[in-house]
Interface confidence: low
């Protein structure tokens, strides 16, 4: 599998992974103890015909072209968890691995 | 996990799974021996704030609102394989399980 990496200076218009730091303090999410911020990344860009398509299905739907089908869109195709320390709804401190918090790769699906 | 199912008569505008039969013969894909057609389904519809969001990451990126971030899009969140009989590039007949050919569920990611 392959995915493009870009930054805010890139001129790449195709589907790409961009850096994004999520700052829980800036969001006012005070129930998160740690980390206060983390590198989440995000996906953005165009999904032209067969570029970075993750599944054969995407290509088939593009060919069949049903009414209302959006065509592929640039979305995470590989994600990873982070460990977090947070208060749950009962004000208990929980330490846990939260899945799908970091985008490792972007593709068209 | 939860996803909406729709058909061509549905008035649902949100992210939904729609039926789609892929016909390999109609595509001229004569290297596929069987099946000649199969139910692939596809995803279409709007992804409003937190509707059917698969990952917490999706919500966080929406909040951080980086330049050019796409927001969630309606895409397969669960897929399944089908068994296929086909000619490979060397004209050999192959029987194999092809992953991610059928959309079982759609969501916003």
């Amino acid at each position: 599998d392959f995915g493009l990496d870009c930054d805010e200076h890139s001129t790449e218009s195709r589907c790409c992974r961009y850096p994004l730091t999520v700052d829980f303090e800036a969001f006012g999410w005070d129930w998160i103890i740690a980390p206060k911020r983390y590198k989440a990344n995000y996906c953005s860009g165009e999904c032209e015909f067969v570029f970075l398509q993750k599944y054969p299905h995407t290509h088939l739907v593009h060919q069949a072209n049903p009414r209302g089908s959006a065509g592929p869109c640039c979305t995470p195709t590989k994600m990873s968890p982070i460990n977090m320390l947070y208060f749950n709804g009962k004000e208990q401190i929980i330490y846990g691995k939260i899945p799908a918090m970091v985008v490792d790769r972007c593709g068209c699906s | 996990d939860f996803g909406l199912d729709c058909d061509e008569h549905s008035t649902e505008s949100r992210c939904c799974r729609y039926p789609l039969t892929v016909d390999f013969e109609a595509f001229g894909w004569d290297w596929i021996i069987a099946p000649k057609r199969y139910k692939a389904n596809y995803c279409s519809g709007e992804c409003e704030f937190v509707f059917l969001q698969k990952y917490p990451h999706t919500h966080l990126v929406h909040q951080a609102n980086p330049r050019g971030s796409a927001g969630p899009c309606c895409t397969p969140t669960k897929m399944s394989p089908i068994n296929m009989l086909y000619f490979n590039g060397k004209e050999q007949i192959i029987y194999g399980k092809i992953p991610a050919m059928v959309v079982d569920r759609c969501g916003c990611s």
């Epitope: 959006a70 | 992804c47 909040q63 609102n65």
Partner: antibody, heavy 124, light 107 residues
Framework: QVQLVQSGAEVKKPGASVKVSCKAS????????MHWVRQAPGQGLEWMGN????????NYNQRFKARVTMTTDTSTSTAYMELRSLRSDDTAVYYC?????????????????WGQGTLVTVSS | DIQMTQSPSSLSASVGDRVTITCKAS??????LSWFQQKPGKAPKSLIY???RLVDGVPSKFSGSGSGTDYTLTISSLQPEDFATYYC?????????FGQGTKLEIK
């Protein structure tokens, strides 16, 4: 139905501040970005910035960044735009507008509902 | 910032006419263009988004087209209520920028 109702006209002196309010009804206020756009008399439209009521995160047009603050009060579903150090060329109608996100690709949204506008006159 | 150049700045037409207004961006805006109608003393009203999609409730006599840097709004058969000022807006990049407007007047 979805509605944005803005505060009444204001007359201010140069150097003063103005705070315009925009009260939302008929939808979940926290789920949609609110934008502010202004229009000087007989002129075109100018984007000032936006705010996400869910968390107060905002983006400002660099042209106003030093003088503008956008805030929200989720308990009353109201957005506010404060402009400081007013000058005569800030005389304009100020609009709030809701960003409707239809969500299939980058920047997939449009302004579906606008406030009626608030005339701010800056004059000595 | 992305500059949006709208033309013409004013236009005289008659009821029943077909009119075209154009908007040119200083760089590719990926079809992230909206069109608005504004009548005197009123807030703008969204007509078209994503270059060619019609906002719900807007009559089909309004249509949009274009890609890259060049976009067009067409009104197929002018009615008295269509005489107003029209603006384009790019929402591909912050800061959002509007065209300077086209005033459509009765001939």
């Amino acid at each position: 139905q979805v509605q944005l109702v803005q505060s009444g006209a204001e007359v201010k002196k140069p150097g003063a501040s103005v705070k315009v309010s925009c009260k939302a009804s008929g939808y979940s206020f926290t789920g949609y970005f609110m934008h502010w756009v202004r229009q000087a008399p007989g002129q075109g439209l100018e984007w000032m910035g936006n705010i996400y009521p869910y968390n107060g995160v905002s983006n400002y047009n660099q042209r106003f960044k030093a003088r503008v603050t956008m805030t929200t009060d989720t308990s009353t579903s109201t957005a506010y735009m404060e402009l400081r150090s007013l000058r005569s060329d800030d005389t304009a109608v100020y609009y709030c507008a809701r960003r409707y996100y239809y969500g299939t690709g980058p920047a997939d949204w449009y302004f579906d509902v606008w406030g009626q506008g608030t005339l701010v006159t800056v004059s000595s | 910032d992305i500059q949006m150049t709208q033309s013409p700045s004013s236009l005289s037409a008659s009821v029943g006419d077909r009119v075209t207004i154009t908007c040119k961006a200083s760089q590719d805006i990926n079809s992230y263009l909206s069109w608005f109608q504004q009548k005197p003393g009123k807030a703008p009203k969204s007509l078209i988004y994503r270059a060619n999609r019609l906002v719900d409730g807007v009559p089909s006599k309004f249509s949009g087209s274009g890609s890259g840097t060049d976009y067009t709004l067409t009104i197929s058969s002018l009615q008295p209520e269509d005489f107003a000022t029209y603006y384009c807006l790019q929402c591909d990049e912050f800061p959002l920028t509007f065209g300077q407007g086209t005033k459509l007047e009765i001939k």
